[in-house]
């Protein structure tokens, strides 16, 4: 019996087609993805093959103005239109709190939404009961297939699930649910979830009875043969894991942003054993036409977005200096504003010992593309912010050793004075440079804001300590020459859309007045400094 699994993950509000790098579509003839194009391909496969499942492994929420405006209603509407068969909850589904998941998505979705390792407690338990499930048994042709869901247990640090949801260890939570499916005589089981490729592989290895793992969160691109676009494969598609009980378990993921449709064909014997699997992600490029009815629907929903982008979010009573003359040479108040917004967006008081789990932010000055003038009645709009942050990136959470941060700050000024983008703006960090020293040895003081403290204060950076830092995904991926971050990071979790983070902060503050306040100091002459 042959099953075709079509899968997406980490779509992040890319409802419209995008450019090849998943940013805003400029030249339509070269654009990719989007739900209208996805629908064309899905329907083509549904017509050609008898047993097809369309699955999503989480993180539909967050990523473009679509989510900012529609807050998840767009996800439910268009996933219903595409007739998804099941979805797993990702960490970003909790970005607007549990209410922001229940009302727009859980109550509106016509497909099951799954997670076996999220347990509700207290008053929420009855409110959310039945709206998401640990597993669902789906009829496919003459057979049944069990789908069991899972979600990153790091979600409380990455999003806003509140205090009434407990995120259990994935493997511990999945095993009893899979065992239950076995007792129900379901002998074909797919684990669908959002914990990253390493956890996907562990689930394949450790959870007895799982036949296939369809994952997300790590934006992993797998491919067999010559890849069709710029993404470099992390391994073959499917990636085959030998389980501890000796079975071959295919593991798949389909990169992100709706650029590809994962396509996996699985052959089961009469006992439900996987005896072969093959496939590849399908690049959704312009050779696949956009479905006209879905496209018309997209255009209808689009109108509200254009109106939104000119509305006032809040006011500034100071000039927001985002000029390259400032942000690539010294501390600029636009950099401070953005970093403060990044930290504010990551406030998660999950432990009495810590005022917050993260206190530090770094931001490449070259990523700040425009100032905002306060002499326009102080008004700040989404449109203004889109000029400051035009690249459609995310502000991510990484874990780094102090020694890596020190290297990053040396890189920040290794060719100072040439108006290059790598000059770092900061939050929760005080750095002093001596620019008369040779490149690679210019950081003379680097103090960081404590997290395990009731009164935050600055302490010298410790080389061997592991720190959490919020930064643009561009830097996490080694952009602007920050190869040391990419090579040495210990953990990387994708965060919220950059503009969304700043707009939310401005809306929350109502009136802003960021200052230049001595976070970054530089001098050009020899002074006697103690090294730290």
């Amino acid at each position: 019996w042959e099953l075709t699994i079509l899968h997406t993950n980490d779509v992040h509000s890319r409802l419209e087609q995008t450019s090849e790098d998943s940013s805003k579509c400029v030249n339509a003839s070269r654009c990719m993805g989007g739900v209208a194009r996805l629908f064309t391909k899905v329907q083509q496969i549904r017509r050609a093959e008898p047993n097809v499942l369309l699955l999503d492994a989480g993180d539909q929420y967050q990523g473009t103005i679509w989510f900012t405006v529609y807050k998840g209603a767009e996800v439910a509407h268009f996933m219903n239109a595409l007739r998804y068969d099941a979805m797993a909850l990702g960490n970003h589904e909790f970005d607007n709190g549990v209410e922001g998941l229940i009302e727009p998505l859980l109550k509106e979705a016509k497909f099951p939404i799954l997670s076996a390792n999220i347990k509700a407690k207290g008053p929420l338990a009855s409110q959310i009961s039945g709206l998401y499930l640990p597993y669902k048994v789906l009829p496919v042709g003459d057979e049944v297939v069990g789908i069991v869901g899972y979600t990153s247990k790091e979600t409380p640090f990455l999003s806003n699930p509140g205090t009434n949801l407990v995120f259990e260890d994935e493997i511990t939570a999945l095993q009893p649910e899979v065992d239950k499916l076995k007792t129900l005589n379901v002998n074909k089981i797919i684990a669908l979830g959002h914990s990253g490729f390493e956890m996907d592989k562990l689930i394949a290895q450790k959870v007895r009875g799982v036949d296939v793992v369809v994952g997300g969160h790590s934006n992993t691109f797998l491919y067999t043969g010559n890849p069709p676009s710029k993404e470099v494969p992390a391994g073959k598609y499917p990636f085959i894991v030998t389980s501890d009980d000796g079975r071959k378990v295919p593991v798949v993921q389909a990169y992100a942003f709706g650029k590809y449709l994962g396509y996996l064909k699985i052959e089961f014997d009469e006992r439900g054993n996987v005896i072969s699997s093959h496939g590849n992600p399908i690049l959704l490029n312009s050779s696949i036409p956009e479905d006209p009815s879905i496209k018309a629907d997209i255009n209808k929903w689009r109108i509200k977005l254009d109106n939104y982008s000119t509305q006032e979010l809040g006011k500034t009573i100071v000039y927001l200096d985002g000029s390259s003359q400032s942000c690539r040479f010294r501390e600029c108040n636009m950099g401070n504003l953005i970093c403060d917004a990044m930290i504010n967006n990551n406030l998660r008081h999950t432990d009495e010992m810590f005022w917050n789990h993260v206190s530090m932010c770094i931001l490449n000055g070259g990523g700040i593309r425009s100032p905002i003038d306060e002499r326009n009645n102080g008004t700040i709009t989404w449109e203004n912010l889109a000029a400051v942050l035009p690249f459609g990136g995310t502000f991510d959470l990484v874990q780094l050793k102090g020694s890596t941060l020190k290297k990053a700050f040396e890189h920040s000024v290794h060719r100072y004075g040439q108006s290059t983008g790598e000059f770092l703006q900061v939050g929760g960090i005080h750095v002093v440079y001596d620019l008369s020293r040779k490149p690679g040895d210019r950081v003379v003081k680097l103090d960081v804001l404590c997290t395990k403290c009731r009164v935050p204060s600055y302490d010298p950076l410790k080389m061997d300590e592991v720190y959490k830092v919020i930064l643009p995904n561009f830097l996490a991926n080694g952009g602007d020459g920050f190869q040391m971050i990419k090579d040495e990071l210990l953990r990387h979790d994708s965060g919220d859309q950059d503009i969304n983070v700043v707009s939310t902060y401005i809306s929350k503050m109502k009136v802003i007045y960021p200052a230049v306040e001595g976070r970054i100091k530089a001098h050009h002459h020899h002074h006697h400094h103690h090294h730290h």
Partner: antibody, heavy 118, light 107 residues
């Protein structure tokens, strides 16, 4: 094409240790499992364990746990099996094998004869 | 551990003969059975896995069948190069186990 080349025959005294190597070529070493199999003269094959060089996931047959150690050097595309506290019943040909998606022991090394004798 | 018992232990046949080797598992192994051919002084070669899937390059005269505890390897028309020892193996669960072998000799 896929090739697994094993180290040469070894003669060891009881109580000693031996380390057999298996050099892989013709494919991406970190993408496939390496299995180790023992065959005593005129006896059936016995599975010792596996190692996945991609993340060094290792699994042993309980029967061989304790005295056998599987390791891999990604940079050298080489897997190793070490047997310690050798006894006469360890005299055998030891094979490494690679899987191929849904086939377990798909490609085999030529075998390494280990003789334990005082 | 699952025991795999082959029969016969040895077998004489002529070129062109149809030959069947059976393998009995001590418990249900579904269709998770592989077959190997081994010649003296050489490493085993995979012939069949998942009961009836031929490995790359294996001639079509080799076929497998069975399910549960009883499995069979059939060689439809013996060729001179087929005289060797054949092993079955279960890949249903760890520890993987092999049969004791069937030696196929020229009559």
């Amino acid at each position: 094409q896929v090739q697994l080349v094993q180290s040469g025959a070894e003669v060891k005294k009881p109580g000693a240790s031996v380390k057999v190597s298996c050099k892989a070529s013709g494919y991406t070493f970190t993408n496939y499992y390496i299995y180790w199999v023992k065959q005593r003269p005129g006896q059936r094959l016995e599975w010792i364990g596996w190692i996945y060089p991609g993340n060094l996931n290792i699994k042993y047959n309980e029967k061989f746990k304790g005295r056998s150690t599987l390791t891999a050097d990604k940079s050298a595309s080489t897997a190793y099996m070490e047997l310690s506290s050798l006894r006469s019943e360890d005299t055998a040909v030891y094979y490494c094998a690679r899987d191929d998606n849904y086939a377990w022991f798909a490609y085999w090394g030529q075998g390494t004869l280990v003789t334990v004798s005082s | 551990d699952i025991q795999m018992t082959q029969s016969p232990s040895s077998l004489s046949a002529s070129v062109g003969d149809r030959v069947t080797i059976t393998c009995k598992a001590s418990q249900d192994v579904s269709t998770a059975v592989a077959w190997y051919q081994q010649k003296p002084g050489k490493a085993p070669k995979l012939l069949i896995y998942w009961t009836n899937t031929r490995h790359t390059g294996v001639p079509s005269r080799f076929s497998g069948s069975g399910s549960g505890t009883d499995h069979t390897l059939t060689i439809s028309s013996l060729q001179p190069e087929d005289f060797a020892t054949y092993y079955c193996q279960q890949h249903y669960s760890t520890p993987f186990t092999f049969g004791q072998g069937t030696k196929l000799e020229i009559k």
